[in-house]
Interface confidence: low
């Protein structure tokens, strides 16, 4: 698998992951012990026809053109988790792996 | 998980599943063998904020709102592989389970 | 405890080869980001590369070559092969852990080894 | 690749002041930033991580910002125990392979 990595001086116009950092601190996420920020990443950009396409399925789609179909966007296509310690609604500490917490590649789907 | 199911009279603007079935014949893809013609499913709709998102990252994302981030867009969150025989392009007949050929579940990622 | 312990460092003739080991207590190996960071006498450290979560490998662009790095999940040991030695990689070499994912932050090492010094010398 | 410039090369201050050590990179790299502390004779030990985060155990007396290329590590009240060698260390690229430190700025105490 394949997918293209940007910054903020990319000139690149397709799908490609950008980081960011989340910060939950500056969101007011009071519940969340740690971390208090990470880096999460996201995807944007433009899916030409069969660029970074992930799935034969989106292909398809494309060929047969049915009502509303948008075509493909770029959007996350690995993730992985993070661990994270935070306080639930009964105000108990949990320590968990909470998944997708980070864009590891970009494509359009 | 959860996710709309919908067909082509409905009303429903938001992120859906619309029933597709895909005909390799009418596309001319005469090197697949078997099956002539399938059920693909596609997604399209609207992706209003938090509706369907699968993942947590997606939130945080609109929150941090960074530059060229384009919003969720409504794309397949469980797919399905089916059985297939072809040509390759040896000319060698192959069976295989082609993976995300069927889209299951659509969701705002 | 938690701890990583070098060993296999000691004096090597120019050309020559050495292999470090890295001996992980405490935790799961292959759970965490292991990279190999040094420190010539009285500088400042210098990065060589890691072994990620998945085995891939990565290095510096001077070490790429000439060093490579390896585990043993078995006997939960990282382990970096040094070839062609010079007398520039005269160091003290540091096992280092990635940080836990908190904050996915492959190379912030927030465990250390005590660190084996290697010269190259004839 | 990065290029990480610190300064100054040696700082020397009594206990109780505020010091400022400034880490420059020779591009953007957003707040992928941390700053170790090495003692002589020992391994460096992570103070701060993603630019501000403070690392587990370490006093709240250090303080990370910055962003982008100018990152600073301040010290509010200058304790003796604090004498030592500060680095900071960043990755090079998006994909988080590849590492840059800086040269390293020593505190003294006076």
């Known amino acids: 698998d394949f997918g293209l990595d940007c910054d903020e001086h990319s000139t690149e116009s397709r799908c490609c992951r950008y980081p960011l950092t989340v910060d939950f601190e500056a969101f007011g996420w009071d519940w969340i012990i740690a971390p208090k920020r990470y880096k999460a990443n996201y995807c944007s950009g433009e899916c030409e026809f069969v660029f970074l396409q992930k799935y034969p399925h989106t292909h398809l789609v494309h060929q047969a053109n049915p009502r509303g179909s948008a075509g493909p966007c770029c959007t996350p296509t690995k993730m992985s988790p993070i661990n994270m310690l935070y306080f639930n609604g009964k105000e108990q500490i949990i320590y968990g792996k909470i998944p997708a917490m980070v864009v590891d590649r970009c494509g359009c789907s | 998980d959860f996710g709309l199911d919908c067909d082509e009279h409905s009303t429903e603007s938001r992120c859906c599943r619309y029933p597709l079935t895909v005909d390799f014949e009418a596309f001319g893809w005469d090197w697949i063998i078997a099956p002539k013609r399938y059920k693909a499913n596609y997604c399209s709709g609207e992706c209003e904020f938090v509706f369907l998102q699968k993942y947590p990252h997606t939130h945080l994302v609109h929150q941090a709102n960074p530059r060229g981030s384009a919003g969720p867009c409504c794309t397949p969150t469980k797919m399905s592989p089916i059985n297939m025989l072809y040509f390759n392009g040896k000319e060698q007949i192959i069976y295989g389970k082609i993976p995300a050929m069927v889209v299951d579940r659509c969701g705002c990622s | 405890e938690v701890q990583l312990v070098e060993s296999g460092g000691g004096l090597v003739q120019p050309g020559g080869s050495l292999r470090l080991s890295c001996a992980v207590s405490g935790f799961t190996l292959s759970h965490y980001v292991k990279g190999w960071v040094r420190q010539a006498p009285g500088k400042g450290l210098e990065w060589i590369g890691i072994i990620n979560i998945e085995g891939s490998t990565y290095y510096a662009s001077w070490a790429e070559g000439r060093f490579t790095i390896s585990r043993d999940n078995s006997k939960n040991t990282v382990y970096l092969q040094m070839n062609s030695l010079r007398a520039e990689d005269t160091a003290v070499y540091f096992c280092?852990?990635?940080?836990?994912?908190?904050?996915?932050?492959?190379?912030?090492?927030?465990?250390w080894g005590q660190g084996t010094l290697v010269t190259v010398s004839s | 690749a990065v290029v990480m410039t610190q300064s100054p090369a040696t700082l020397s201050l009594s206990p109780g002041e505020r010091v400022t050590l400034s880490c420059q990179a020779s591009q953007s790299i957003h707040h992928d930033l941390s700053w170790y502390q090495q003692k002589p004779g020992q391994p460096p030990k992570l103070l701060i991580y993603?630019?501000?985060t403070l690392a587990s155990g370490v006093p709240s007396r250090f303080k990370g910002s910055g962003s982008g290329t100018d990152f600073t590590l301040t010290i509010s009240s200058l304790q003796p125990e604090d004498a030592a060698t500060y680095y900071c260390q960043t990755y090079d690229g998006i994909s988080h392979y590849g590492v840059a430190f800086g040269q390293g700025t020593k505190v003294e105490i006076k």
């Open positions: 993603l630019a501000s």
């Open positions: 280092a852990r990635g940080h836990d994912n908190f904050g996915y932050s492959y190379h912030d090492f927030n465990l």
